[in-house]
Interface confidence: low
């Protein structure tokens, strides 16, 4: 695959984990617990999130309360959000570095700055797919303990929300497509052949550039 | 070999007390819940209380509250319960169990403690 | 509290049948998280303390001969014993462990 399309296709990936990350960092369903209330009929459902809290009941009404002081948030809420919105600030200034980097743009001239520029853009999109998963993971292992501590009631036990799947998705997208923009800029930099032919002369040489290792996918 | 042998039962009068103890052996005590399970004379089990790996957090059956204590020592790999204000229906074998995800894996042998007058 | 129904409370067996004992809870035990149904089975013979033979519906306890089969989900769960040997002849308690308070059935007594 040439190292334009290898380019797209990991930019692409890595818009729709981008937009997956958002999703995951504003919906309320990190943690989801459904229990019957004992004093009334209805079942309901209570979803917790970064930023706030809604119960749900078996009649569809849904009311959400935003989480009033930072103070008051634990530990873990206060981490996650900072880690998330880290990750989405982070993939947001690794759009306009793969955007300078990237071979259909003339931002950067052509040559191995280009490449590093598009490197740059690849590596800082894995990082931010690392990042977005250390507040996933660490949820999720709460959560996780919580269900099994014998000492938590069950209306204190939740079980993993759907904003966690979307998150773990979101971030392997972001890995991924981070991997193979750090290919793209590899085989642009070793391969010149490969590359989109462009209208500027200057030199190519291949550089020593990090090679991707398919063991950093998660 | 898991091992769990529960000490300290015995006849008491109604409104005294009793503590219970529970020596664990085979198995890295503080790795797992603990908990008491009883058995009144002919009669099914029923759950006592529960304590967490460091001892931080206990929670206890609805007949017994206010009036037992749960409690471990983890460098004595000990297990113990201590009943206050004792009553005729908690004339039961106090069995001590291992705790892991919120079932009872291995229990003690059971010690009879008998509450009467 | 969620309570623990068990039927019957005694049933008279004979070796080499296979016995279906019945529990049922007033609340589902299944997780849609984990997709699991917590509930554990127990066998306790005349003077010795109750074994682990099955948790989380179906999961066997290792050691535990695989004649015993837990099944089951949400609030109807069955323990069958296939070809029931001598030793088998016990009380047999079912426990929900899916919330404080842990409770058990009441027993199903399996005599001669």
């Known amino acids: 695959m040439g190292s334009a399309a290898l380019e797209i296709l990991g930019l692409v990936l890595c818009l729709v984990g981008w937009g997956g990350l958002i999703l995951a960092c504003g919906l309320p369903m990190w943690q989801v617990t459904a229990f019957l209330d004992h004093n009334i009929v209805t079942a309901q459902t209570t979803w917790k999130g970064l930023w706030m809290s809604c119960v749900v009941q078996s009649t569809g009404h849904m009311q959400c309360k935003v989480y009033d002081s930072v103070l008051a948030l634990s530990t873990e809420v206060q981490a996650a959000r900072a880690l998330t919105v880290g990750a989405v600030l982070l993939a947001f200034v690794a759009l306009f570095v793969t955007l300078a980097g990237a071979q259909c743009t003339t931002c950067v001239a052509p040559g191995p700055a280009k490449a590093r520029v598009a490197l740059t853009g690849g590596v800082l999109y894995l990082l931010c797919g690392l990042l977005a998963l250390v507040p996933l993971c660490w949820f999720a292992n709460i959560v996780v303990r919580e269900f099994y501590d014998p000492s938590v009631p069950v209306s204190q036990k939740y079980e993993l929300g759907a904003a966690l799947y979307i998150g773990w998705a979101a971030t392997a997208l972001l890995m991924v497509g981070g991997g193979l923009l750090c290919c793209g800029a590899w085989v642009c930099t070793s391969r010149p052949d490969l590359s989109f032919p462009v209208k500027y002369s200057a030199p190519r040489r291949p550089t020593a550039t990090g090679d991707y290792d398919k063991k950093n996918y998660v | 070999e898991v091992q769990l042998v529960e000490s300290g039962g015995g006849l008491v009068q109604p409104g005294r007390s009793l503590k219970l103890s529970c020596a664990a052996s085979?198995?890295?005590?503080?790795?797992?819940?603990m908990a008491w399970v009883r058995q009144a004379p002919k009669k099914g089990l029923e759950w006592v209380a529960s304590?967490?790996?460091?001892?931080?957090?206990?929670y206890y059956g609805d007949s017994v509250k206010d009036r037992f204590t749960i409690s471990r020592d983890n460098t004595k790999t000990t297990l113990y319960l201590q009943m206050t204000s004792l009553r005729s229906e908690d004339t039961a074998t106090y069995y001590c169990?291992?705790?892991?995800?919120?079932?009872?894996?291995?229990w003690g042998q059971g010690v009879m403690v008998t509450v009467s007058s | 509290d969620i309570v623990m129904t068990q039927s019957p409370s005694s049933l008279a067996v004979s070796a080499g049948e296979t016995v279906t004992i019945n529990c049922k809870s007033s609340?589902?035990?299944?997780?849609?998280?984990?997709?699991?149904?917590?509930l554990a089975w127990y066998q306790q013979k005349p003077g010795q303390s109750p074994k682990m033979l099955i948790y989380?519906?179906?999961t066997r306890e290792s050691g535990v001969p695989d004649r015993f089969i837990g099944s089951g989900s949400g609030t109807d769960f069955t323990l069958t014993i296939n070809t029931l040997q001598a030793e088998d002849l016990a009380i047999y308690y079912c426990?929900?462990?899916?919330?404080?308070?842990?409770?058990f059935g009441a027993g199903t007594k399996l005599e001669l």
């Open positions: 169990a291992r705790h892991p995800r919120r079932y009872f894996d291995f």
């Open positions: 426990q929900q462990h899916y919330d404080i308070p842990y409770t």
């Open positions: 989380l519906a179906s």
């Open positions: 304590i967490n790996y460091e001892g931080s957090r206990t």
């Open positions: 085979g198995f890295t005590f503080s790795d797992y819940f």
């Open positions: 609340r589902s035990l299944f997780s849609s998280g984990y997709q699991e149904n917590y």
